[in-house]
Interface confidence: low
């Protein structure tokens, strides 16, 4: 691949895993035992973007699928979606901004801020089995902190 990537899984700070919910949506729920195999494996690509010491621009693709998390406006609201791309052209170093997230590491936890919509973060609900979404608040009810687990390629 033309861009450096690593394979990983993500869990929110309540240890909920991310799984596919239909063809174009992720949901967060607690998994145990063999059910852990359901969790999605991301191919996290390190891409160009506006970066600083604590913000690293990444793209989050689903491993071996031509799907990437992207941020778009729907009904005037920043929205998280899974977008299908041409696998011949992705991943690439200079990803379109809607695919880029600023990976922010704080106290061994990760936040993923939309590069397209600053201060909007990949979020999960406190409730079980709810969609992963783009949220505009930190520190409230919704969860914006994640941990990353390295997966061998």
């Amino acid at each position: 691949a033309p861009v450096r990537s690593l394979n990983c899984t993500l869990r929110d700070s309540q240890q909920k895993s991310l799984v596919m919910s239909g063809p174009y949506e992720l949901k967060a729920l607690h998994l145990q035992g063999q059910d852990m195999e359901q969790q999605v494996v991301f191919s996290m690509s390190f891409v160009q973007g506006e970066e600083s010491n604590d913000k690293i621009p990444v793209a989050l693709g689903l491993k071996e699928k031509n799907l990437y998390l992207s941020c778009v406006l729907k009904d005037d609201k920043p929205t998280l979606q899974l977008e299908s791309v041409d696998p011949k052209n992705y991943p690439k170093k200079k990803m379109e901004k809607r695919f880029v997230f600023n990976k922010i590491e704080i106290n061994n936890k990760l936040e993923f801020e939309s590069a397209q919509f600053p201060n909007w973060y990949i979020s999960t609900s406190q409730a079980e089995n709810m969609p992963v979404f783009l949220g505009g608040t930190k520190g409230g009810q919704d969860i914006t902190d994640f941990t990353m687990q390295f997966v061998s390629s």
Epitope: A1, P2, L6, F150
Partner: antibody, heavy 128, light 106 residues
């Protein structure tokens, strides 16, 4: 001061083994990916392999020319990385360097684009 | 396997601008970096992630990368810049170096 020091080089016969050490100081050793490179006399730089930091499983990658013969490991409690070289060949004769990924890149992926701290190198001569 | 090609030598007069190129297939889609190595010394990183300069590297060093070519530019070249320069990129979890360019300051 951030520093890496290689040791363990010397003269060895073809087919034999040698273990090089890379000792770090002045930084949190376990957080960083570490590389081994080599440079044959009068030649350019050649990558040997690297080991990722603990956050990324300490996994390794190797150049095709050494895969299966060389093994990289690390002992973060001692701030040492090792290069175990088996079945040495005359073409493995070189100065061997270890280095550390760029500070800026540490939190991104534990291996990044560029190495900002290099050791002074240790010479390995494989000859009968 | 992926290859990076550099000119074996480049000459420049003091105070002039030196450009060292590094070519590889779709190199602009990868991150490139550059190392300076003086005789008997370890390499020194001068440019990483195409354009970034580590602390302590003079501003006269700059980098660019697009298409199939990465370029290291040294403006206002000084005698102390005479050295070998190596480009480096990533390809499929491996590190690839160019063959090196000897910069001579006339």
């Amino acid at each position: 001061e951030v520093q890496l020091v290689e040791s363990g080089g010397g003269l060895v016969k073809p087919g034999r083994s040698l273990r090089l050490s890379c000792t770090g100081s002045g930084f949190t050793f376990g957080d960083y990916a570490l590389n081994w490179f080599r440079q044959a006399p009068g030649m350019g730089l050649e990558w040997v392999g690297f080991i990722r930091g603990k956050a990324y499983g300490g996994t390794t990658e190797y150049a095709a020319s050494v895969k299966g013969r060389f093994t990289i490991s690390r002992d973060d409690s001692k701030s040492i990385a090792y290069l175990q070289m088996n079945s040495l060949k005359t073409e493995d004769t070189a100065v061997y360097y270890c280095n550390r990924e760029v500070e800026y890149c540490r939190s991104s992926e534990n291996y990044c684009y560029g190495m900002d701290v290099w050791g002074q190198g240790t010479t390995v001569t494989v000859s009968s | 396997s992926y290859e990076l090609t550099q000119p074996p030598s480049v000459s420049v007069s003091p105070g002039q601008t030196a450009s060292i190129t590094c070519s590889g297939d779709k190199l602009g889609d990868k991150f490139a970096c550059w190392y300076q190595q003086k005789p008997g010394q370890s390499p020194v990183l001068v440019i990483y992630q195409d354009t970034k300069r580590p602390s302590g590297i003079p501003e006269r060093f700059s980098g660019s990368n697009s298409g199939n070519t990465a370029t290291l530019t040294i403006s206002g070249t000084q005698a102390m810049d005479e050295a070998d320069y190596y480009c480096q990129a990533w390809d499929s979890n491996t590190v690839v170096f160019g063959g090196g360019t000897k910069l001579t300051v006339l």
